[in-house]
């Protein structure tokens, strides 16, 4: 389904991060971290959910630790005072790894997924409407924070137009430090117009939200591949486009299209088989030069999650994978405005679009 | 037979305005990008900006940015580039041009072109 | 901006000869590189697209090559009508640049 009205992403975070969460926590938003643990002697990192900036009033702490074979610590501190701690033994997250951490508030707990899959329920302390923060800190570096409002509509065919987004603009700079890691690209550009959070069903029948169920998360939610949608308004310079997924361990090849009618504006396609990330435009038919000059090695690998965000600047796109700029790409196509569908196909499972 | 007429030149003093105008005719219009370059008596050309009809999306070169509008009227079949803080260095002759497909950037239709002359 | 220059900015050839032009661009702009024949007081005819496509209509005495950021203009032999300006375009970047131009006389 589509997440409209939603907050616009903060993009490439530095850590410790603090940022604003506009309206404060809502029964049925959901919340998506999206970063990589730090390989780095650092044993642990927290993303908390609290009042203000102080780090006095946390509704909910959720803290991995790479000790004593790995643990996941949840708490809630009030007043400056931590209460009991819960602790799940088992660790998802892996030191140098991708994540896509999702946390969905609902009226009585916090369900915490990782990568795609539910990992843990938290059960609320104190009332979550008091939480207007977010905050990360640790062992982490971070690709994105973005936040979905849920609708009230079922979900649209996996096929069709999803519904309109309201207008949405990048907040502004959070409190705290915020300077960028080497080789990301400003956090805040122009306004975006535009933010549709894409999710699906995770079985016929089941969906994330109607006007009468509160939303609910399934394990193991998966996109349709190929998926297509489509990117309301077309590109513009700030619009920005998130992926994440999970690469399939056999994968020999997959592909994110921009699209104007008949003709790819950009095709991007990593290609385990040739240890390549291939760019190309395709008009009538007909490919262009294959661009695959790379800054460094190749930043997909089977088996393993990634995110990539996609910037339209007035000139190019810019790409960045797991938060780490990777390359430029000229456009070809460039009457933006037409580049109006997005489709991803190939050897990979989605676990998160945002257009 | 496609064809493109400027017109709108003249002579106008430094920081005053002047809007060119390209009627297009023997072609869809609207499926073209349409660019105006410019050529300083002597020089060499110079690309301005374009547009593309059907979306109103444009590019601008640095040195016109913020100062040059273009604009496109498809009922009328016919582009606009409206010329502000005009200063002696925009003197030229601007040409409306067209690419020669759809998706393409090399130009092979143009206009006569029309003279602008920006002095005190 | 991606800067291409020109060279030479003159030169004089007679009927017959071969004549070459290049232009140099100040990062790779893949073949997306134009080139145009102006005569005084004329507009620009296209003569090359896509670094070496030669448009329709233009005498094949007229070739484009490249080598990296390096374009070529060749004409094979000069014919009278050959006597113009040259120039060559990048299209790789929205922001067209042209180069300087190379003033073709008669020796």
């Known amino acids: 389904m589509a997440f409209s009205g939603s907050q616009a992403p903060y993009l490439s975070p530095a850590v410790p991060f603090s940022g604003t969460i506009q309206g404060g926590l809502q029964d049925g938003l959901q919340i998506t971290v999206n970063g990589t643990v730090l390989s780095s002697s650092g044993t642990r990192f927290a993303v908390n959910f609290q009042t203000g900036f102080s780090g006095n009033d946390i509704a909910f702490h959720f803290n991995p630790r790479f000790e004593d074979g790995g643990y996941v610590v949840c708490n809630t501190r009030q007043n400056g005072s931590w209460g009991p701690e819960e602790r799940k033994t088992h660790m998802p997250f892996q030191k140098g790894m991708p994540f896509d951490l999702c946390f969905l508030v609902q009226s009585s707990d916090f369900k915490v997924m990782v990568n795609g899959i539910l990992f843990v329920q938290y059960f609320h302390r104190v009332p979550f409407h008091r939480v207007d923060t977010i905050s990360v800190n640790g062992s982490v570096q971070l690709s994105y924070i973005s936040f979905q409002n849920p609708r009230t509509v079922p979900v649209q065919p996996a096929f069709s137009t999803v519904p309109f987004s309201q207008p949405v603009c990048f907040p502004p700079r959070p409190r705290g430090r915020r300077q960028k890691p080497p080789g990301v690209w400003p956090a805040n550009p122009a306004p975006i117009t535009q933010t549709v959070i894409h999710t699906v069903q995770s079985a016929p029948g089941q969906m994330f939200s109607t006007p009468a169920i509160p939303p609910m998360m399934y394990p193991h939610p998966a996109y349709p591949m190929p998926f297509i949608t489509t990117i309301l308004g077309g590109l513009y310079p700030s619009k920005s486009i998130l992926l994440s997924g999970t690469v399939l361990p056999s994968a020999q090849r997959f592909h994110i299209n921009l699209c104007s009618g008949n003709h790819i504006a950009f095709h991007l396609n990593p290609r385990f088989d040739e240890n390549a990330v291939v760019r190309n435009t395709q008009i009538d038919n007909s490919w262009g030069s294959e661009e695959r000059s790379l800054p460094r090695k190749m930043p997909f690998v089977r088996g393993q999650s990634f995110s990539v965000w996609i910037l339209c600047e007035a000139h190019c796109l810019k790409v960045a994978v797991d938060g780490q700029h990777l390359f430029e790409y000229y456009h070809r196509l460039r009457n933006l405005p037409t580049i109006n569908r997005l489709e991803v196909g190939g050897d990979i499972q989605l676990t998160h679009v945002q257009t | 037979e496609v064809q493109l007429v400027e017109s709108g030149g003249g002579l106008v003093q430094p920081g005053g305005s002047l809007r060119l105008s390209c009627a297009a005719s023997g072609f869809t219009f609207s499926q073209y990008a349409i660019h105006w370059v410019r050529q300083a008596p002597g020089k060499g050309l110079e690309w301005v900006a374009r547009i593309y009809p059907d979306s109103g999306y444009t590019y601008y070169a640095d040195s016109v940015k913020g100062r040059f509008t273009i604009s496109a009227d498809t009922s009328k079949n016919t582009a606009y580039l409206q010329m502000n803080s005009l200063r002696a260095e925009d003197t030229a002759v601007y040409y409306c041009?067209?690419?020669?497909?759809?998706?393409?950037?090399?130009?092979?239709?143009w206009g006569q072109g029309t003279l602008v002359t920006v002095s005190s | 901006d991606i800067q291409m220059t020109q060279s030479p900015s003159s030169l004089s050839a007679s009927v017959g000869d071969r004549v070459t032009i290049t232009c140099r661009a100040s990062q790779s702009v893949s073949r997306a590189v134009a080139w145009y024949q102006q005569k005084p007081g004329k507009a620009p005819k296209l003569l090359i697209y896509?670094?070496?496509s030669l448009y329709s209509g233009v005498p094949s005495r007229f070739s484009g090559s490249r080598s990296g950021t390096d374009f070529t203009l060749t004409i094979s032999s000069l014919q009278p009508e050959d006597f113009a300006t040259y120039y060559c375009q990048q299209y790789y970047s929205p922001l067209l640049t042209f180069g300087q131009g190379t003033k073709v006389e008669i020796k």
């Open positions: 896509s670094a070496s």
């Open positions: 041009a067209r690419p020669y497909h759809q998706y393409a950037e090399g130009m092979d239709y």
